[in-house]
């Protein structure tokens, strides 16, 4: 889904039945700690020397919804995610480095604590390098482990 084609997606009013209180997780892992903004996430990543995982998604995108469910229910991914600074965004940032090959969703981009976008950590689709589908959880898990091997260890 290309967010330049359709943005400002709204939640179905019928979907606003009582649920758990809305958190920054937006359903990607309620037990995890999520940052609110990209700027905060970069600061936390640099100061804690932990990589940042940025998930771009839209409420009204079927592939975002589908990936969110498998991500949230995948125990190993959820456990490994504790070692990251986490951010999920339903809007695009002004940092073009977070969309190396376009503003599609869902896409997952990793950022090193040195504030280098890990453009080398890609999914399996040549036309959308940072896209993941529900069948790609094993690859995503491997890529998360790859991102944890930092580019430069700070002394």
């Amino acid at each position: 889904k290309d967010t330049t084609v359709k943005s400002g997606a709204k939640k179905d009013p019928k979907d606003s039945r009582p649920k758990l209180p809305q958190t920054l997780s937006r359903g990607w892992g309620d037990q995890l700690i999520w940052t609110q903004t990209y700027e905060e996430a970069l600061y936390r990543s640099k100061t804690s020397n932990r990589p940042l995982m940025v998930i771009h998604h839209l409420d009204e995108c079927p592939h975002s919804q589908a990936l969110k469910k498998v991500f949230a229910e995948h125990k190993e991914i959820q456990k490994l995610a504790e070692q990251f600074v986490l951010l999920n965004l339903v809007y695009e940032t002004t940092d073009k480095h977070l969309s190396p090959d376009g503003q599609y969703v869902p896409r997952i981009v990793f950022v090193d604590p040195s504030l280098t976008v890990r453009a080398d950590i890609t999914g399996r689709y040549s036309n959308r390098l940072y896209a993941y589908e529900p069948s790609d959880t094993a690859l995503l898990y491997d890529n998360m482990k790859k991102a944890l091997k930092l580019l430069k260890t700070e002394l």
Epitope: K1, D12, K14, R17, C61, H63, A66, E73, P134, S135
Partner: antibody, heavy 120, light 107 residues
Framework: QVQLVQSGSELKKPGASVKVSCKTS????????MNWVRQAPGQGLEWIGW????????NYNGKFKDRFVLSADKSVSTVYLQISSLKAEDTAVYFC?????????????WGQGTLVTVSS | DIQMTQSPSSLSASVGDRVTITCKAS??????LSWFQQKPGKAPKTLIY???RLVDGVPSRFSGSGSGQDFTLTISSLQPEDIATYYC?????????FGGGTKVEIK
């Protein structure tokens, strides 16, 4: 093996409600999206909406937002489509269709269909 | 909503013929397209997903191709049991939308 078994045909009067069920077996019920599709007599297919049985999240085709409600009961691995204030134009076969085995959105397995006839 | 234009609406071919059905989306849908076969009075059966992936158990004479806006379902050698109506479906964006269908008959 995966099975989706739908409830039997219904004859209803205009203004009444109907609840169609789709009982599933052979896979992890809570982890696959369930779609509902309708087909009016002699017509093509129309997507009504989907539900994620794990947490009840739904999304509806705007055309069906007002009178159509999707729900799921994990205890009996069954999803439901309820239509209220029935109209003659709701006369159709209603199908449930499971999403991909891995949680993907594509429609993989289909129920046999339930004919709902609305007539006075 | 994304419009799916399927053509032809009907076709007649001989057993053994190569049959091609096309589906055109009103906007780019990546490869998020499925093909279904429906016989009279029966539920649809999924043949292809993600434009070109064959569902387990579907005969290899069925194949799908395309991405972006233009997609094709090909039956390499038409068999009598292939008489049915075929539908495409885009699942890139809500609401999912079907093509109008192609009725395949034997000459």
């Amino acid at each position: 093996q995966v099975q989706l078994v739908q409830s039997g045909s219904e004859l209803k009067k205009p203004g009444a409600s109907v609840k169609v069920s789709c009982k599933t077996s052979g896979y992890v019920f809570s982890r696959s999206w369930m779609n509902w599709v309708r087909q009016a007599p002699g017509q093509g297919l129309e997507w009504i909406g989907w539900i994620y049985p794990g947490d009840g999240d739904t999304n509806y085709n705007g055309k069906f937002k007002d009178r159509f409600v999707l729900s799921a009961d994990k205890s009996v691995s069954t999803v439901y489509l309820q239509i209220s204030s029935l109209k003659a134009e709701d006369t159709a076969v209603y199908f449930c269709a499971r999403g991909g085995y891995d949680g993907s959105p594509w429609l993989s397995y289909w129920g046999q269909g339930t004919l709902v006839t609305v007539s006075s | 909503d994304i419009q799916m234009t399927q053509s032809p609406s009907s076709l007649s071919a001989s057993v053994g013929d190569r049959v091609t059905i096309t589906c055109k989306a009103s906007q780019d849908i990546n490869s998020y397209l499925s093909w279904f076969q429906q016989k009279p009075g029966k539920a649809p059966k999924t043949l292809i997903y993600r434009a070109n992936r064959l569902v387990d158990g579907v005969p290899s004479r069925f194949s799908g191709s395309g991405s972006g806006q233009d997609f094709t379902l090909t039956i390499s050698s038409l068999q009598p049991e292939d008489i049915a109506t075929y539908y495409c479906l885009q699942y890139d964006e809500f609401p999912f939308t079907f093509g109008g269908g192609t009725k395949v008959e034997i000459k």
